[in-house]
Amino acid sequence: LRLLDFPAPVCAQEGLSCRVKNSTCLDDSWIHPRNLTPSSPKDLQIQLHFAHTQQGDLFPVAHIEWTLQTDASILYLEGAELSVLQLNTNERLCVRFEFLSKLRHHHRRWRFTFSHFVVDPDQEYEVTVHHLPKPIPDGDPNHQSKNFLVPDCEHARMKVTTPCMSSGSLWDPNITVETLDTQHLRVDFTLWNESTHYQILLTSFPHMENHSCFEHMHHIPAPRPEEFHQRSNVTLTLRNLKGCCRHQVQIQPFFSSCLNDCLRHSATVSCPEMPDTPEPIPDYMPLWEPRSGSSDYKDDDDKGSSHHHHHH
């Protein structure tokens, strides 16, 4: 959570002299309450906008907009405090609009905007606009708050922002997964234009359950430049467990910009359709071997094998 460094924010408009200042989120009117305070903001709206930094990077920003109520309290309005709280980390950032001239009623409703709060993909924020001075302790609240959910990097516009591109959002592996037979799964995907390794994480589940019955990890070495953007295929050997038939394949890249924290892509193969009269299963025969505690992935030489090819 930070402020855009360019261009300098502006709050002045026709009929109002105003400047934007950094704020500690604790306006002086908290400490020294005033008798007469303005009413709360009206029609607070927050939208996702995008802005370039001086360096040319593109970031998602919260575009905050609100209007004033058409009452006499605007005569006592000295400014506004804009606060953004990131829900998961409790980090808060504030700015203050400081009015340098008195507001007057005129033919149109006063409207204010601010678009300098840089936000993160897939995060949730509480945006509050507080009119200043803040009310006395038992006074009516003169703020309005709204939640703002930033889309993740799969969102079309977010995909091309700097934070998303850094986490590998432009790579589309176009994964296809095919069951060759009861013991083999073929995975095809498109390599990215970087000489970096990949991992395929296979997790298998019983038909209607969410507890895994088989896990396997397969390492794919870094492709050569001539293999960039080519299809790679891997054949994974499954553990032959009856009913362990729903397979989730996740491909984890290790791009230099995001290392072990890159966006992953996955595909799932459902269990085959069950016949109307299923074969009887002997009583008390477990569907898979129960494993306690650890859910560590098996690596290549442990109960699962695989091989891969790059297609030119």
Partner: antibody, heavy 118, light 107 residues
Framework: EVQLVESGGGSVQPGGSLRLSCAAS????????MNWVRQAPGKGLEWVSI????????HYADSVKGRFTISRDNAKNSLYLQMNSLRDEDTAVYYC???????????WGQGTTVTVSS | DIQMTQSPSSLSASVGDRVTITCRAS??????LAWYQQKPGKFPELLIY???TLQSGVPSRFSGSGSGTDFTLTISSLQPEDVATYYC?????????FGPGTKVDIK
Amino acid sequence: EVQLVESGGGSVQPGGSLRLSCAASGFTFSSYSMNWVRQAPGKGLEWVSIISSRSSIIHYADSVKGRFTISRDNAKNSLYLQMNSLRDEDTAVYYCARPKVGGGMDVWGQGTTVTVSS
Amino acid sequence: DIQMTQSPSSLSASVGDRVTITCRASQGISNYLAWYQQKPGKFPELLIYAASTLQSGVPSRFSGSGSGTDFTLTISSLQPEDVATYYCQKYNRAPFTFGPGTKVDIK
């Protein structure tokens, strides 16, 4: 001293209701989101709910959605959890917890015990 | 929803041993991970947040590492007062799920 004190726990029959309270002191309560976390006897921690500083964001664990309601009164420095349609599996120690700036929860209450039993 | 798993579920080690607990998220959570210590009959205490930042007042023998899906809590030299259950918690987005816990005791 930063402090959270829970109250309102007790014994209730399945289907009954309880309202838990958490009194905060020693910090600017209205600046913080707040959480409820519970722990069933002999079990691990389970996150229950969060409410943002101005109550505009509220989330619940799937296990309590539709039955529990989190709320707060910043003027009273208080956090609440209204629990309806209580079940045996809601038996637990309930903690209120304040998030740390940067992540995690750094201030916890001592907990209040809720027992659901017929 | 993202699932959190911890391993081992329990461990016994000698005083002075190096102890490692792992936590895995079923999807990437960046570095939005916290570790807690809970002693019997007490409330949990925050040890580490942002995957590797030591909470103020926590002994330096505790450290955290990892990013994405795989995280580690390490106690460099186990002390008798470290007997407790350790939980990881993800906080990238609600629900802020905890791992099932790892019980640590002294041999």
